[in-house]
């Protein structure tokens, strides 16, 4: 469960995370799992472990195999495992798969790509970016601190993008590099003014006192991906996180929905325990975008009980 | 969302032993430790100790370390705390309770309701 | 183990007001945690790692302090802030909290 595969190339640094986290005061113990041999911490060793971090400056093939880490918490000793490949370079441009970090996609509107792991790293700007191993040239291509952006994507920037950076250890450098796929979505994107969809502009919703509510706020901001873009409740015009009222919750993250191939935003308001006080409040439905904000506003009304009497 | 449902008062004989029971929901069971923490009438928090579900590891406070045992049912993501050789002082509300994010150890952010055990001759 | 001696044990303020709770640990600790606890009710957590606030908790509500003392401050007293609010340490264990601070109403 606690385990995570990480991979390098020989005569280039790898830095690894152990998979289990604590807090920087907490004591974190690397063996080198087949021998059960300690893993020192000594910087004079290429392979040294320095709290959370597994080093090897630089990495060999021999490496290779499963690294143990400790995490030595005040109750418990949290076990997590690092499995490490260390692979020859080769001596043609093609990347290999199994050297491949996770796939990223971009559009016309929004094109970065992440060097991988590089957090792990102390490296200094700038990156340098290869395209299928040639370096890439030209204005439309900006190495931005950790990323690297390309205007006007167009569908031939598809490919396999390198990132090669220097680490420096202890006045030493060492060479890293890392790739990933780089897809493009083909969409013509756009965004416009934000278009609530609910609530209607000032609605009065129907409640019942004790029971639960759910308010939906809902706002469609464009097509394709959206640079900014957020929707979110108000009480009285504060947050609701600081408004300071535990039975009002927002639903923790937005969800995003594709209507008719728009970009829509929607964001849950949940009362728990309806209480008559929740009627004198306002509640805003906010949609914002960088074309500007939109408010929709909703009241709450008590729910008359059913009438039985004939 | 994460829920932690306790089971109901107990009373119990000095010298008589009680079982308590948290049910764990909303978030996978044996990622997270689960800590007992008991409250005397009127008087503050008590940590009594913890168990790691996945492994059934625990640790306690050494106050309780004669008298407690701490379990965990995988198949149900139920946790229990057995206290034995129960006395009158033992008279309080038993809480189970998780950290928010596990290795951070970043505070007990859910609660159980509590499970008030009466020892009483 | 680390004892953790709140002060003053019982607070008496009127609604507005600033509070300041403190808490003497008697060994040095990395972090500290900080609950409100209301009768009949779980505590609930407020204040993490000395000066996160947890999930959902107003911006009233804020921590300091480093090694053997630490705060809690409630800028302006709300009527629901009336309480007991208790320190804990996870710093080694056995894990131990503050004897409480009650907030009441002057």
């Known amino acids: 469960k606690f385990s995570k595969q990480s991979w390098g190339l020989e005569n280039e640094a790898l830095i690894v995370r152990c998979p289990r986290q604590g807090k920087p005061s907490y004591t974190v113990d690397w063996y080198y799992s087949q021998t059960n041999k300690s893993i020192p911490t000594q910087e004079r060793n290429r392979v040294f472990a320095s709290g959370q971090l597994l080093k090897f400056l630089p990495a060999a093939v021999a490496d290779s195999g499963i690294y143990t880490c400790i995490v030595r918490s005040p109750t418990f000793n949290r076990t997590g495992y690092a499995n490490v490949t260390i692979y020859k370079k080769q001596s043609d441009c093609n990347v290999p798969d199994y050297l491949m970090y996770s796939t990223v996609s971009g559009s016309e509107k929004n094109s970065k790509i992440y060097c991988p792991t590089i957090d792990l790293y102390n490296w200094t700007a700038p990156l340098e970016w290869f395209k299928n191993c040639q370096a890439l040239q030209g204005s439309r291509y900006r190495a931005h601190k950790s990323f690297l952006v390309i205007d006007n994507v167009m569908t031939e920037d598809a490919g396999d993008y390198t990132c090669k950076f220097i680490h420096n250890e202890n006045g030493a450098n060492y060479s890293v590099t890392a790739t990933r796929s780089f897809t493009v979505k083909d969409e013509q994107g756009f965004s416009l003014f934000p278009v609530i969809g609910a609530p209607a502009q000032n609605e009065i919703k129907e409640v019942e006192i004790g029971k639960n509510a759910n308010l939906t706020c809902s706002a469609c901001f464009g097509k394709g991906t959206q640079f900014l873009a957020a929707v979110l409740w108000q009480l009285n015009g504060t947050k609701i996180t600081d408004f300071g009222e535990p039975r009002i919750q927002q639903e923790e993250g937005q969800n995003q929905s594709f209507s008719n191939g728009l970009a829509c935003l929607d964001m849950v308001l949940r009362i728990a325990d309806v209480k008559e006080e929740d009627l004198l409040l306002q509640y805003d439905c906010l949609a914002l975008n960088l074309h500007g904000l939109r408010r929709h506003t909703v009241r709450l009304s008590r729910k008359n009980p059913i009438d039985h009497h004939s | 969302q994460v829920q932690l449902v306790q089971s109901g008062a107990e009373v119990k004989k000095p010298g008589a032993s009680v079982k308590v029971s948290c049910k764990a929901s909303?978030?996978?069971?044996?990622?997270?430790?689960l800590h007992w923490v008991r409250q005397a009438p009127g008087q503050g928090l008590e940590w009594m100790g913890t168990i790691d579900p996945e492994t059934g590891d625990t640790v306690y406070n050494q106050k309780f370390k004669a008298r407690v045992t701490m379990t965990a049912d995988k198949s149900t993501s139920t946790a229990y705390m057995e206290l034995s050789s129960l006395r009158s002082e033992d008279t309080a509300v038993y809480y189970c309770t998780r950290a928010f994010y596990n290795d951070y150890d970043d505070g007990f952010a859910y609660w159980g309701q509590g499970t008030l055990v009466t020892v009483s001759s | 183990e680390i004892v953790l001696t709140q002060s003053p044990a019982t607070l008496s303020l009127s609604p507005g007001e600033r509070a300041t709770l403190s808490c003497s640990v008697s060994s040095s600790v990395s972090y500290m945690h900080w609950y409100q606890q209301k009768p009949g009710q779980a505590p609930r957590l407020l204040i993490y790692d000395t000066s996160k606030l947890a999930s959902g908790i107003p911006a009233r509500f804020s921590g300091s302090g480093s090694g053997t003392d630490f705060t809690l401050t409630i800028s302006s007293l709300e009527p629901e802030d009336f309480a007991v609010y208790y320190c804990?340490?996870?710093?080694?264990?056995?894990?131990?909290f503050g004897g409480g601070t009650k907030v009441e109403i002057k």
């Open positions: 804990q340490q996870w710093n080694s264990s056995p894990l131990t």
């Open positions: 909303g978030y996978t069971f044996t990622d997270y430790e």
